[in-house]
């Protein structure tokens, strides 16, 4: 058995239904993506050796169904997927990967075939652990290559400042595979968002410890770089379920007003 | 309000290029594709192609590919079209439009071929 | 691509009549279908989008309906100012498309 959890259950009625739905959120540019033809590309990756899967397979899936990211809109992240996807707001806000089409059908989903078989392996497939060339990492890889490269404008970063390793992961796929693939013309800065969790601890904030590696990696690509703790409108979002919390407590003299009224 | 304001029209030899912009204002230039339709006198409606907000993708009709060329300035929310080898028949008014609806269009400029 | 063809090409009728032209696609545009309105030096005025949804500002005696691969428009009681070319484009993805137009003048 492998060490990841085996493909999703229905995966192809997922992949399809979620492709149909986005299709709607599509300019009038954009919206003829062929749902069925973009599942065919990604299928090519089931029929490999579920260890030989690298993301140039996946090259055909994203050629038909890439499409534009609006300028500003880029929403890169680690640690933080969850809160990401709320705070996007289904591409409302932000685009992050998991809210362009590429992303989207395939976000939170595993698959890979059998060892020695052609059918699913719904058991467990494998992570990193078991081999590098796995089905879902060289998708991730290959969607996160894309992503960078189609990203313009004003770049957001969400990261995780109760994370206990740090909020950058020197190895990660926003090290690894996105960071390189920015297209510096392209781009006017870079703003990086620290969150905290509510009641969680603080490892680490703008200028310390792993994002100063960052920060320096940026400048000396030659992009403008501003870092911000606790960015206020995520930190709302976030209070929504932590409404009592200390760290929620609002604290203008507007709010303390309205209370009292 | 929305305008997208042309450049003036154009007398071009056969086999030469012209370039034709198209200012925005009015609107966030960077989040709508720009669009761009010709009409030949007397004639329909032609869709030549467009390209995207954040400059990443452009779509030209099969037609003018290898001839049409798309661009845009964000900094001065100006789109371009620059058509080469130009024939006879590319004596046209040259519209600019904001995408995904074709809701605002620019006046049209003409551009005539004649040796 | 898909191709667009408009009926009739032309059509020759008086105020306060009504009028029908219809655009076919070549393939299903589901309701991805628009119609514009242009006179003469003129550039092209949206009239209807999404098959029936009315332009800002344009009159409800115009009135789309159809989808899939048959459209059609309506003018409930021409007016005057309705004399012009009529074109059918579907918005559903590029190459956009534009139909061949129709003639509306006045009998």
């Known amino acids: 058995r492998w060490r990841g959890e085996g493909t999703s259950a229905h995966l192809r009625d997922i992949f399809l239904g979620r492709c149909a739905e986005y299709r709607a959120l599509l300019s009038p540019e954009q919206r003829n993506k062929n749902c069925t033809a973009i599942w065919e590309a990604f299928k090519v990756a089931l029929d490999k050796d579920p260890c030989s899967v690298l993301p140039s397979d996946y090259d055909l899936f994203i050629n038909l169904s890439r499409h534009s990211i609006p300028r500003d809109k880029s929403l890169f992240w680690e640690n933080s997927h969850l809160l990401v996807n709320s705070f996007a707001d289904n591409t409302r806000r932000f685009m992050p990967l998991s809210d362009v089409l590429y992303g989207r059908v395939a976000d939170f989903l595993s698959w890979c075939r059998q060892k020695n078989d052609s059918g699913l392996d719904y058991q467990s497939c494998p992570t990193s652990e078991d081999c590098e060339n796995n089905p879902v990492d060289s998708f991730w890889k290959r969607a996160s290559i894309q992503y960078s490269k189609d990203s313009s404008g004003v770049i957001h970063v969400m990261l995780n400042g109760s994370e206990p390793t740090g909020a950058y992961p020197i190895k990660g796929f926003f090290a690894d595979y996105e960071i390189p693939n920015l297209q510096k013309e392209k781009i006017t800065r870079i703003e990086i968002w620290v969150m905290h969790e509510i009641g969680g601890p603080n490892v680490e904030s703008c200028g310390e410890g792993s994002m100063k590696v960052l920060e320096k990696r940026l400048k000396d690509m030659g992009f403008q770089y501003s870092c911000i703790n606790d960015y206020r409108p995520v930190k709302l979002l976030q209070c929504v379920d932590h409404s009592t919390h200390p760290d929620c407590a609002l604290k203008s003299a507007a709010a303390a007003t309205q209370r009292k009224a | 309000q929305v305008q997208l304001v042309q450049s003036g029209a154009e007398v071009k030899k056969p086999g030469a290029s012209v370039k034709v912009s198209c200012k925005a204002s009015?609107?966030?230039?960077?989040?709508?594709?720009v669009h761009w339709v010709r009409q030949a006198p007397g004639q329909g409606l032609e869709w030549m192609g467009a390209?995207?907000?954040?400059?990443?993708?452009?779509d030209y009709s099969q037609k003018f590919k290898g001839r049409v060329t798309m661009t845009r300035d964000t900094s001065i929310s100006t789109a371009y079209m620059e058509l080469s080898r130009l024939r006879s028949d590319d004596t046209a008014v040259y519209y600019c439009?904001?995408?995904?609806?074709?809701?605002?269009w620019g006046q049209g400029t003409l551009v005539t071929v004649s040796s | 691509e898909i191709v667009l063809t408009q009926s009739p090409s032309s059509l020759s009728a008086s105020v306060g009549d009504r009028v029908t032209i219809t655009c076919r696609a070549s393939?299903?545009?589901?309701?991805?279908l628009a119609w514009y309105q242009q006179k003469p030096g003129k550039a092209p005025k949206l009239l209807i989008y999404?098959?029936?949804t009315l332009g800002e500002g344009v009159p409800s005696r115009f009135s789309g309906s159809g989808s899939g691969t048959d459209f059609t428009l309506t003018i409930s009681s021409l007016q005057p100012e309705d004399f012009a070319t009529y074109y059918c484009?579907?918005?559903?993805?590029?190459?956009?498309?534009f139909g061949p137009g129709t003639k509306v003048d006045i009998k």
């Open positions: 439009a904001r995408g995904g609806l074709l809701q605002y």
């Open positions: 009015g609107y966030t230039f960077s989040d709508y594709w």
């Open positions: 390209i995207d907000g954040s400059d990443t993708f452009n």
């Open positions: 393939e299903n545009i589901y309701s991805y």
């Open positions: 999404n098959t029936k």
């Open positions: 484009q579907h918005h559903y993805g590029t190459p956009f498309t």
